[in-house]
Interface confidence: low
């Protein structure tokens, strides 16, 4: 799912207040709900009829530093016999997410939000049939 | 996939630099890669063998204000005949994502990162069989 554009309102102060100096805002340290955890079924990437592998990308100047990307293993889906059925398609499920980019200039450290496209997993779909006219 | 804890290093300045005043940091306005877009296959939530519905949650003090959550429509999966097959399971695919929380204290506006658990879609899996001893 996609993240809408910021526009020019979210990060601004109310009109009656003085403007934000120097095009930057105050970001408080600490993360709300930091202890919240994913509770997905075990090994769904292997047990799925549209199985996938994970690749980890690492960047020390990004939070989170680790971003995990899924790749569908097959073009088709795995049937009850464990064989690939190409009458169906394994397709990626994508999600836009925010990360924080750290920018250094000597002792001056600032941060900026960055939009990242993450493939979270795969699902098995009936293909769209294009009829030849 | 889960976001690791912040720890105490990412948002800190280098050791040789004076500490961050008042427990806050400078967040630059603007979003890197803001125009990046999800390019998922059309209507996969309806075409999937583990179909799902979307619910939109709205919060004006969050960026993005709109967060979309998926809910699996069935316990089982949809077979080639369009019937639910309960020998298989539809399971949610979850992703931890960051949002930005806007905090007002009069004209003092600050922001804080918040972790949100998003169900992105569903996939069809072979159930885990628990053998009775």
């Amino acid at each position: 799912r996609k993240i809408p554009k910021v526009g020019h309102t979210f990060f601004q102060k109310p009109e009656s207040c003085p403007p934000v100096p120097g095009g930057s805002m105050k970001l408080d340290i600490g993360i709300i709900n930091e202890n919240q955890r994913v509770s997905m079924s075990r090994n769904i990437e292997s047990r799925s009829t549209s199985p996938w592998n994970y690749t980890v990308t690492w960047d020390p100047n990004r939070y989170p530093s680790e971003v995990v990307q899924a790749q569908c293993r097959n073009l088709g889906c795995i049937n009850a016999q464990g064989k690939e059925d190409i009458s169906m398609n394994s397709v990626p499920i994508q999600q836009e997410t925010l990360v924080v980019r750290r920018k250094h200039q000597g002792c001056s450290v600032s941060f900026q939000l960055e939009k990242v496209l993450v493939t979270v997993g795969c699902t098995c779909v009936t293909p769209v049939i294009h009829h030849v006219q | 996939r889960k976001i690791p804890k912040v720890g105490h290093t990412f948002f800190q300045k280098p050791e040789s630099c004076p500490p961050v005043p008042g427990g806050s940091m400078k967040l630059d306005i603007g979003i890197i890669n803001e125009n990046q877009r999800v390019s998922m296959s059309r209507n996969i939530e309806s075409r999937s063998t583990s179909p799902w519905n979307y619910t939109v949650t709205w919060d004006p003090n969050r960026y993005p204000s709109e967060v979309v959550q998926a809910q699996c429509r069935n316990l089982g999966c949809i077979n080639a005949q369009g019937k639910e097959d309960i020998s298989m399971n539809s399971v949610p695919i979850q992703q931890e994502t960051l949002v930005v929380r806007r905090k007002h204290q009069g004209c003092s506006v600050s922001f804080q990162l918040e972790k949100v658990l998003v169900t992105v879609g569903c996939t069809c899996v072979t159930p885990v069989i628990h053998h009775v001893q």
Epitope: G30 | G23, D59, N61, K103, H104, C107
Partner: antibody, heavy 126, light 107 residues
Framework: EVQLEESGGGLVQPGGSLRLSCAAS????????MNWVRQAPGKGLEWISY????????HYADSVKGRFTISRDDATKSLFLQMNRLRADDTAVYYC???????????????????WGTGTTVTVSP | DIQMTQSPSSLSASVGDRVTITCRAS??????LNWYQHKPGEAPKLLIY???TLQRGVPSRFSGSGSGTDFVFTISSLQSDDFATYYC?????????FGGGTKVEVK
């Protein structure tokens, strides 16, 4: 001076309706989340409703859900509570309350209620 | 909504006494707990937030502790100005629910 002043209370019969108002002054009302809290005779404080800023989400205590509606008009710096299908156990002093935040040692935000009105009395009786 | 259970509902004490009030949440709320003092005809006053942090200007005889579901509020040496009703309030959810209150009366 930061102030909240409630009005609209009174005597009403069970099943009746009442609309409470709260006039804010001395602070930028539109920037603050607001609440209604009540205190029944001889009882403790009971939070009943919350409204976010900018027409954001509203929340209600189970005891009033489906009967009470909170709303705000930032242009007139007013908070409202529309009370329908009133019952005898709704009899209480109703306070309009501002929600504020303090930042803890761990940099989390901790909400609390910092500015309270003097209250308006609602009596539900046949 | 999260339910807050406060005990005792009332207690009698004398100036100089140590007073302890407990508050239990129906589910874990980490340290999202406030304590207020409420006197008749006055607005409730915040004493403690984040379970144990004293609000600016509040005397050090007031203290709080606890995390998760169980919390304790203590007045180390009761003063004449402290006779009032005390409330805990959870702030872990949008519904900032209160405990039933503890009335501290003169013995």
């Amino acid at each position: 001076e930061v102030q909240l002043e409630e009005s609209g209370g009174g005597l009403v019969q069970p099943g009746g309706s009442l609309r409470l108002s709260c006039a804010a002054s001395g602070f930028p009302f539109s920037n603050y989340e607001m609440n209604w809290v009540r205190q029944a005779p001889g009882k403790g404080l009971e939070w009943i409703s919350y409204i976010s800023v900018s027409g954001g989400p509203a929340h209600y205590a189970d005891s009033v859900k489906g009967r009470f509606t909170i709303s705000r008009d930032d242009a007139t710096k007013s908070l409202f509570l529309q009370m329908n299908r009133l019952r005898a156990d709704d009899t209480a002093v109703y306070y309009c309350v501002r929600r504020e935040y303090v930042t803890g040692r761990n940099y989390n935000y901790y909400p609390y209620m910092d500015v309270w009105g003097t209250g308006t009395t609602v009596t539900v009786s046949p | 909504d999260i339910q807050m259970t406060q005990s005792p509902s009332s207690l009698s004490a004398s100036v100089g006494d140590r007073v302890t009030i407990t508050c239990r949440a129906s589910q874990t709320i980490s340290d999202y707990l406030n304590w207020y003092q409420h006197k008749p005809g006055e607005a409730p006053k915040l004493l403690i937030y984040s379970a144990s942090t004293l609000q600016r200007g509040v005397p050090s005889r007031f203290s709080g502790s606890g995390s998760g579901t169980d919390f304790v509020f203590t007045i180390s040496s009761l003063q004449s100005d402290d006779f009032a009703t005390y409330y805990c309030q959870q702030t872990s959810s949008t519904a900032l629910t209160f405990g039933g209150g503890t009335k501290v009366e003169v013995k």
